[in-house]
Every structure is written in C-alpha cells, then in structure tokens.
Interface confidence: low
C-alpha cells in the first residue's frame, strides 16, 4: 500500500523549480539546467523538451515550466502539445501519404491543413447554387428556384466567412 506522506515531510516545503534532494538531507535544491519542476514537493526535476529539427521553440523552458514547441513555417502542429509537425499543403489540396494532392472534383479545402470536404448540396435545403464551388471554396447557396420568380426581390449573397487561421508563413 502507499504510505501517506506525513505532515512533517520536509519535501512538501520544496517549491516549484526545486526538487527534494535525498542526497543532501532532503534540502530543496534548484532544478539543474535544462530541467524543471512545475509543482512543489517533487523529488526529481523533469528534463526540458527540446524543440529540434522541424520543431521550433515557442516558449523557452524555465525552472518551473516545460518548453513549448511549434512548427517551422510550412508545417503545422498535430497532437497534444504539438507532438508532431505535419507539412502544410496549399488551399485546394489535402495531405496524403505521398504528399499534397489536389482535391477531387466536388470537394474543397480552404485551409493549408486537413482534408478535402464535399461541396454543400444546396438542393437538400431546397436552395440553388448561387456561386459554383472550386477546389479552394465551397459552393454558395442562394434562394430556392421558386424564390427567383419574376418580381421577387434580388438577394445579396452572404459575405464569405473569415478565413481560418493558418500556420505562420
């Protein structure tokens, strides 16, 4: 069974950025270079993450917090805490295991990451296509054909949605 730490445990007094050094009579010692402890009472410090290769440092390691990485331009983060970098593609493409591939007809991708998605089917909502789709943009649906009968007021197409954020270039 796990023994509960006694209230007198001297290690509980060691703040973040230090560790309880068993080799020095449980004195609170500062974390060595390139290591950190983010909570108090730690018996060891953790090694700082190194942002190498396609990773670049977004936040330097400190004695109390780990380094944070992002990706070099032309790549974007994947996974928790940016555990991987994946190559950007151009708008109108998706990344396959053999590189960037143009979206098939009837699909689009308006970002530099992610997959190609099907164009909206306007007819499912009883609407008509106002602006045709492209590899980079979804179709714009307009009023239903019945609404376009003579005498009906003209309809202004909706403003395009703001483009989603991209990886830094």
């Amino acid at each position: 069974f796990e023994r509960t730490r006694s209230l007198q445990d001297p290690c509980s007094n060691c703040p973040a950025g230090t560790f309880c050094d068993n080799n020095r009579n449980q004195i609170c010692s500062p974390c060595p270079p390139n290591s950190f402890s983010s909570a108090g009472g730690q018996r060891t410090c953790d090694i700082c993450r190194q942002c190498k290769g396609v990773f670049r440092t977004r936040k330097e390691c400190s004695s109390t917090s780990n380094a944070e990485c992002d990706c070099t331009p032309g790549f974007h983060c994947l996974g928790a805490g940016c555990s991987m970098c994946e190559q950007d593609c151009k708008q109108g493409q998706e990344l396959t295991k053999k590189g960037c591939k143009d979206c098939c007809f009837g699909t689009f991708n308006d970002q530099k990451r992610g997959i190609c998605r099907p164009w909206t089917n306007c007819s499912l909502d009883g609407k008509s296509v106002l602006v045709n789709g492209t590899k980079e943009r979804d179709v714009v649906c307009g009023p239903s054909p019945a609404d376009l009968s003579p005498g009906a007021s003209s309809v202004t197409p909706p403003a395009p949605a703001r483009e989603p954020g991209h990886s830094p270039q």
């Epitope: 994946e86 053999k98 590189g99």
Partner: antibody, heavy 126, light 107 residues
Framework: QVQLVQSGAEVKKPGASVKVSCKVS????????IHWVRQAPGKGVEWMGG????????IYARKFQGRVTMTEDTSTDTAYMELNSLRSEDTAVYYC???????????????????WGQGTLVTVSS | DIQMTQSPSSLSASVGDRVTITCRAS??????LNWYQQKPGKAPKLLIY???SLQSGVPSRFSGSGSGTDFTLTISSLQPEDFATYYC?????????FGQGTKVEIK
C-alpha cells in the same frame, strides 16, 4: 530505415532505351513516393519526374515527357525508370530518391529528397 | 518553372573558416527550400529541409536561414570533410528545381 538500391551501370547506343531499377528495403514501396533525378558529368542536378499523390500517374518534367516512363512494382518493392530514344546528352548518373519521407521517425513528411539511391551511370555512345 | 540561383558558384576556404552560400528563388517559395551536400561519385545528401531544419545526423555547424526568395546555408567552422558541392532545391511547386551548385574547395 529505408534504403534504395539501384541497378548497375549501362552502356547504350543512340536511339536505344534504358530501364533503371530502384529496389526499396526497410519500408514498402507503397509507403514511399519515388522520384528520379539525373546528373550529367560535371553538371547540376535535374528532376525528371516522380510519383506525387496516391493513385495518380507519375508527373514528368516537360523536358522528358513522351520519352520517359516511370513505373512501380509493389509486389517486389521496385521502382523503374525507362528512358527511350537515347542521345549522347542523356549520358548521366540517374538517381532514385524518396520524397516526403521521414527517415527518422519524428512524425513529419515534407517535400525533400531523402534518402537517395547510389546512382546508375548510363553512357550513351555509338 | 521556378529558377534557383546560387552564389558563389565556387569558393576557396580553409579549415575553420565560416562559409556562407546563398540561394535566390525567382519567386517567393515560403520556406520550401532544402540544401544538399554532394561529394564526388556519391549521391546528394540532405542537410537542411524547410529552410532551417537540420536533418538528423547532420553536424550542428551547418545551419540554414531565410524565407520568401532569399536563403543562406552557413557552415560555422569548415571541416576537412565539408569540402564538397552544395545544392539548394525548392519544393514549393512542381517541378522541383535545383540551384546550379556551389563548389567549396580547399584554399
């Protein structure tokens, strides 16, 4: 890790064809994107073409269109480059190279050539 | 096609020297720029990808910088094994194109 091993040197007469092979080991050919690059004696590096996305025909440099054919045999993990109507200026070392392949397991893919085959010298002479 | 221009085409340097090679693209290529080293009779070897990322196993004396149209490969302290020809290559668009090469020779 992936390795590319090419077929041996060839000597051909003008007008003939040559077919160079590139055997993949360490990974399967279907996991890779193989490109072909050539280098004439004392000259720079020239991309000939290669396989980009999945399930699509290879893309060829304009200069070689109609003369080059690139194929893959996934059953033997071997890529091939055939060049027809050879002329003396086709004398060069021909390399296969893997594109967009992360050889070191860090979870990335990108547009660079690594690793390369050892090269195949093709000499065209009458 | 995107044209890649390297300078100088050749240079003479001594062991321990700091060497800089530049590569200019005819249009913006973001960070899609790679550097290779080639020794006589050998295939090119990838040194730097994505303009500034050091390929695994490549010594840290090699570094790359730049984005857009202007890029630099720097060897901080030239070693005997670094005498070779260096090529830049853009992968922003098809066809991928290479610079004409920079030969680094012993002074």
């Amino acid at each position: 890790q992936v390795q590319l091993v090419q077929s041996g040197a060839e000597v051909k007469k003008p007008g003939a064809s040559v077919k160079v092979s590139c055997k993949v080991s360490g990974y399967t050919l279907s996991e890779l994107s193989i490109h072909w690059v050539r280098q004439a004696p004392g000259k720079g590096v020239e991309w000939m073409g290669g396989f980009y996305p999945e399930d699509v025909e290879p893309i060829y440099a304009r200069k070689f269109q109609g003369r080059v054919t690139m194929t893959e045999d996934t059953s033997t993990d071997t890529a091939y480059m055939e060049l027809n109507s050879l002329r003396s200026e086709d004398t060069a070392v021909y390399y296969c190279a893997a594109e967009g392949f992360d050889n070191y397991g860090s979870g990335i893919r990108g547009n660079w050539f690594d690793p390369w085959g050892q090269g195949t010298l093709v000499t065209v002479s009458s | 096609d995107i044209q890649m221009t390297q300078s100088p085409s050749s240079l003479s340097a001594s062991v321990g020297d700091r060497v800089t090679i530049t590569c200019r693209a005819s249009q913006s290529i973001s960070s899609y720029l790679n550097w290779y080293q080639q020794k006589p009779g050998k295939a090119p070897k990838l040194l730097i990808y994505a303009a500034s990322s050091l390929q695994s196993g490549v010594p840290s004396r090699f570094s790359g910088s730049g984005s857009g149209t202007d890029f630099t490969l720097t060897i901080s302290s030239l070693q005997p094994e670094d005498f070779a020809t260096y090529y830049c290559q853009q992968s922003y668009s098809t066809p991928p194109t290479f610079g004409q090469g920079t030969k680094v020779e012993i002074k």
